[in-house]
């Protein structure tokens, strides 16, 4: 018996389905096949789960957060023995494997390996600004999404004529800041916050207004 | 070496399309706002299209505007010009140009070599 | 026809002094930074000048912009022949970038 080599990894959007594949060449009837999917999750590596078995002729569900959503690709009893797993979600992350037995058909490679990653676009980010924003201060613009995977970059533009920032300005793209230096009544106006990952974009606005001092009254 | 390097020029008939590449390297792609400049055999500069370092926002010139879309891959530090609807005249250079960052106007500090497009029968 | 307006030619003697003039309107140099590009014969532009009077590093002191109203300038002094070349000025409106027509220096 031995189970082709999978793909090494997979990546898919939360919540469209994912195909894990696994097939495998025997020189057996498929009467006495078994076959037992485990999941080890990225969130709880010292917790392996079942996801599905398959054995005696008949299926098995595995944990109950796969209820309802995992099935073989094709009918069973087969040398494919693919799963597809619907609606996935952040926790379906991990490492899967594949562990097919078919009696008497011993020896060779048994099981398979397929790593699902489940991606998240970001999510709306918050635009805010740090620090006053009197004329020749410093100001700091910061944005987050407080979801993401991969981590988004956050990649800040002014809203004008030019599609760039001052060149006054710093900007960290991982940590989603810009310094803006010694902002003038040129730094005002509108700034756009862009979150981006693999999969998706998400953007914020934020309205700078530079204050000007308010000439003195001398009594 | 901060370069630029555009590629996908050609001879195309009237009314077919093309895509131009330009692939940056040295420098961070997604800090810069980037811009298409064209010049037909013999005449001036003229600016055709331009990006914002997310690609979020796009101009373009109207006399390509609904047939020319600008585009940008920052994962793969490329800039994009997808032509339709070719006409004779576009026929150009067309050059790839980076905005400065140490301007507050626009500024291109740094331009491709170059890659002609024909539009000709 | 160009948004901005040069003109076609100038000319002048190693060692002189030579002026290019580039009109606009509110809409573009107006109210907005110009720039000056120097593009030699099969050759792509270089930035010569940006936000109207600043010279990238490596550019020499002898070229210099200016701006007032409507209206901008690119002064070269001291002509050497090498600058004999074809000179843009560029600017920039509502969701537009401009190039002026060039004009072409001639070094006698």
């Known amino acids: 018996l031995e189970v082709s080599e999978s793909p090494g990894s997979i990546q898919v959007a939360r919540g469209q389905p994912a195909v894990l594949p696994c097939t495998f060449t025997t020189s057996a009837a498929l009467i006495n096949l078994n076959v037992i999917w485990m999941v080890t999750p990225l969130s709880n590596a010292n917790q392996p789960e079942q996801v599905i078995l398959y054995q005696g002729g008949q299926m098995f569900d595995g944990a109950p957060r796969f209820h309802g959503r995992v099935g073989f690709t094709g009918t069973m009893p087969a040398t494919n023995v693919s799963i597809f797993i619907n609606n996935t979600q952040l926790s379906d992350t991990g490492t899967y494997q594949c562990l097919v037995n078919n009696l008497p058909d011993i020896g060779g490679r048994n099981i398979g390996v397929t790593g699902l990653t489940v991606l998240v676009p970001p999510s709306a980010p918050h635009c805010q600004i740090q620090g006053s924003q009197d004329i020749g201060s410093d100001v700091i613009l910061l944005c987050s999404s407080e979801e993401g995977i991969p981590r988004p970059t956050y990649l800040w533009e002014k809203l004008d004529n030019t599609l760039k920032l001052p060149p006054t300005a710093t900007q960290d793209q991982v940590q989603g800041t810009v310094t803006i230096r010694n902002i003038s009544a040129l730094s005002s106006g509108l700034y756009q916050c862009v979150a981006s990952n693999a999969i998706g974009t998400s953007t914020c606005l934020l309205d700078l207004q530079v204050i000007s001092p308010q000439p003195r009254n001398i009594g | 070496e901060v370069q630029l390097l555009e590629s996908g020029g050609g001879l195309v008939q009237p009314g077919g399309s093309l895509r131009l590449s330009c692939a940056a390297s040295?420098?961070?792609?997604?800090?810069?706002?980037m811009s298409w400049v064209r010049q037909a055999p013999g005449k001036g500069l003229e600016w055709v299209s331009a990006i914002s370092g997310s690609g979020g926002s796009t101009y373009y010139a109207d006399s390509v505007k609904g047939r020319f879309t600008i585009s940008r891959d920052n994962s793969k530090n490329t800039l994009y010009l997808q032509m339709n609807s070719l006409r004779a005249e576009d026929t150009a250079v067309y050059y790839c140009?980076?905005?400065?960052?140490?301007?507050?106007?626009?500024?291109?500090?740094?331009w491709g070599q170059g890659t002609m497009v024909t539009v000709s029968s | 026809a160009s948004v901005l307006t040069q003109p076609p030619s100038v000319s002048a003697a190693p060692g002189q002094k030579v002026t290019i003039s580039c009109s606009g309107s509110s809409s573009n140099i107006g109210n907005n930074y110009v720039s000056w590009y120097q593009q030699l014969p099969g050759t792509a532009p270089k930035l010569l000048i940006y936000d109207n009077n600043k010279r990238p590093s490596g550019i020499p002191d002898r070229f210099s912009g200016s701006k007032s109203g409507t209206s901008a300038t690119l002064g070269i002094t001291g002509l050497q022949a090498e600058d004999e070349a074809d000179y843009y000025c560029q600017s920039y409106g509502h969701r537009s970038f401009v190039f002026g027509g060039g004009t072409k220096l001639t070094v006698l």
């Open positions: 140009a980076r905005d400065s960052r140490d301007a507050y106007g626009v500024a291109f500090d740094l």
């Open positions: 040295g420098f961070t792609f997604s800090s810069y706002a």
